[in-house]
């Protein structure tokens, strides 16, 4: 056998080169046949009615042909025949790679609520071979479940991702990325998560600046409530008591002028949106005016709450004053 060929892998729409090579040439006729055994080239002549085949080189030692705009139907065995005595035959296999036609990502819900599990699907249509789909949430790779559907030698891959969303996922891209031998570089599509979550409430003491409340002083608290959608209602209440007569409420701000001991207690900022409610408590302790002889020690007390809490502890250990937990967020 002195007739040689090489297998060819080509991307759909591109050019395949088929070469029939003869080691010891002797003027014998070289012929190239397609998978249906129809003659494409007889020497340097193309009887086949397919002008996508063009002669690149013809000599006694080589018949080299290009096939442009390759399609999936061109795949198969191409036969080189050398009419020696006896005749010789060798075949080359053309494998056609088809990149996915399009990549579609579909999220079950446009807007999800924190803690909810949502389904995200990504479909890579009509590729050959089947596409590998990878999932990312931001930079973190996640595991999906793929199903492959075959139709006429082409593969459609659908990957399903079940994703439990958290408030931190809001605005984070969910990326569907494909890996395929016909695709160079990154072929991906993404959707940004929109996650609704209940408010996070935080109380900030804006006055007095040193954080110590004494009789006769003023107190200003600001309630910061962040949620999605933005909380529609922010209210101040005094737990287990009436709000002092001299307290002034202005939106998220609570002002109490001329503090006295009767103002001691827990002040609660409540915020709500369509997802839920949350609150944060501020425990006010009004101290005596400063004295000349300071007590030698300071004490810290801790309050336990019934929900998960973020504690902001504001303490002052200056002589003659008692520090306390000032705010508890719920």
């Amino acid at each position: 056998q002195n007739l040689f060929t090489k297998d060819v892998t080509v991307i759909e729409g591109e050019v395949a080169t088929i070469s029939c090579q003869v080691n010891k040439s002797d003027d014998s006729v070289i012929q190239l046949l397609n998978p249906n055994r129809q003659t494409i080239y007889f020497r340097d002549f193309r009887p086949l009615k397919d002008s996508r085949f063009q002669l690149l080189n013809f000599s006694s030692s080589e018949l080299k042909v290009s096939l442009t705009n390759v399609s999936i139907s061109d795949e198969g065995r191409y036969f080189c025949q050398l009419y020696t005595d006896p005749p010789q035959e060798s075949y080359t296999t053309i494998t056609v790679l088809v990149p996915p036609r399009n990549l579609m990502i579909d999220i079950q819900k446009d807007t999800a609520v924190e803690g909810e599990e949502i389904e995200v699907n990504c479909t890579a249509m009509a590729s050959k071979p089947a596409t590998t789909i990878r999932w990312f949430k931001g930079n973190t790779e996640l595991k999906g479940k793929s199903e492959v559907e075959e139709w006429s030698d082409m593969y459609t891959v659908t990957s399903q991702l079940m994703l439990k969303v958290h408030k931190e996922d809001d605005g984070v891209p969910v990326i569907c990325q494909v890996e395929h031998p016909a695709v160079t570089g990154n072929l991906q599509t993404q959707r940004y998560l929109e996650v609704q979550y209940k408010p996070q409430v935080h109380i900030q003491m804006t006055y007095p600046l040193q954080g110590l409340t004494r009789e006769g002083d003023a107190l200003e608290l600001t309630c910061e409530a962040i949620g999605k959608p933005q909380p529609v209602m922010v209210t101040w209440v005094r737990v287990d008591d009436e709000m002092p007569q001299h307290a002034v409420l202005s939106g998220p701000n609570l002002f109490i002028n001329n503090l006295n001991k009767t103002d001691n207690g827990t002040y609660r900022c409540e915020a709500s949106n369509i997802v839920g409610k949350a609150h944060s408590d501020y425990m006010l302790y009004v101290y005596d005016p400063p004295t000349t002889i300071p007590p030698p020690t300071t004490t810290t007390t801790t309050t336990t709450t019934t929900t998960t809490t973020i504690l902001t502890i504001i303490t002052d250990s200056r002589a003659g004053e008692e520090g306390s937990i000032r705010a508890v967020d719920h």
Epitope: S28, F42, R46, P47, L48, K49, L82, Y83, T84, P87
Partner: antibody
């Protein structure tokens, strides 16, 4: 000059045998596909047989088993051995270079099968 | 075994264009070759393949093919084009060759 010259035709009785020759000049018979084509009086062209450069041979159904195509490379000559001749084999026999396209033809030799 | 079908005869005024057709299953895949034969002469190849005209053949001879039909066109026929014309092709994938029945072209 590229040329083909047939010979060997004549009058032959039904059942008889005849060998046609086709001498080539200007090219090598063994490196080419060589065909025999015939034309009955007042009729069209009919392909008879082919020999490929590698030596493979093929025949029209009407002559299969009766005719044999061959060549002598040293003489650069093509042959058609015709046995069991019938009246319907009466024709002008042409040898030609090629199959997909026959670009060189001889002038032909006449074979008449008659009693 | 398939066959190639040609119109038996066609006439054309000198200087006019004439088209000779050839029909057959093998022509779905292959281009035919076309031969001109004048009385008491051997056939002569005038056109073959997609667009091949042998040297010495005038450029008024051209070929085309679509589906299972191929055509030989003589644009501006001359008196010397008065002859029989044959199409030829391979018989499918078999190592047999076909000729059409021939078309007699008369140049008036």
């Amino acid at each position: 000059e590229v040329q083909l010259v047939e010979s060997g035709g004549g009058l032959i009785q039904p059942g008889g045998s005849l060998r046609l020759s086709c001498a080539a000049s200007g090219f090598t018979v063994s490196s080419n596909y060589m065909s025999w084509v015939r034309q009955a009086p007042g009729k069209g062209l009919e392909w008879v047989s082919v020999i490929y450069s590698g030596g493979s041979t093929y025949y029209a159904d009407s002559v299969k088993g009766r005719f044999t195509i061959s060549r002598d490379n040293s003489k650069n000559t093509l042959y058609l051995q015709m046995n069991s001749l019938r009246a319907e084999d009466t024709a002008v026999y042409y040898c030609a270079r090629g199959t997909w396209y026959m670009d060189v033809w001889g002038k032909g030799t006449t074979v008449t099968v008659s009693s | 075994s398939s066959e190639l079908t040609q119109d038996p005869a066609v006439s054309v005024a000198s200087g006019q264009t004439v088209r000779i057709t050839c029909q057959g299953d093998s022509l779905r895949h292959y281009y035919p070759s076309w031969y001109q034969q004048k009385p008491r002469q051997a056939p002569v190849l005038v056109f073959f393949g997609e667009n091949n005209r042998p040297s010495g053949i005038p450029d008024r001879f051209s070929g085309s093919a679509s589906g299972n039909t191929a055509s030989l066109t003589i644009a501006g026929a001359q008196a010397e084009d008065d002859a029989d014309y044959y199409c030829s092709s391979r018989d499918g994938n078999d190592d047999r060759w076909l000729f059409g029945g021939g078309t007699k072209v008369t140049v008036l």
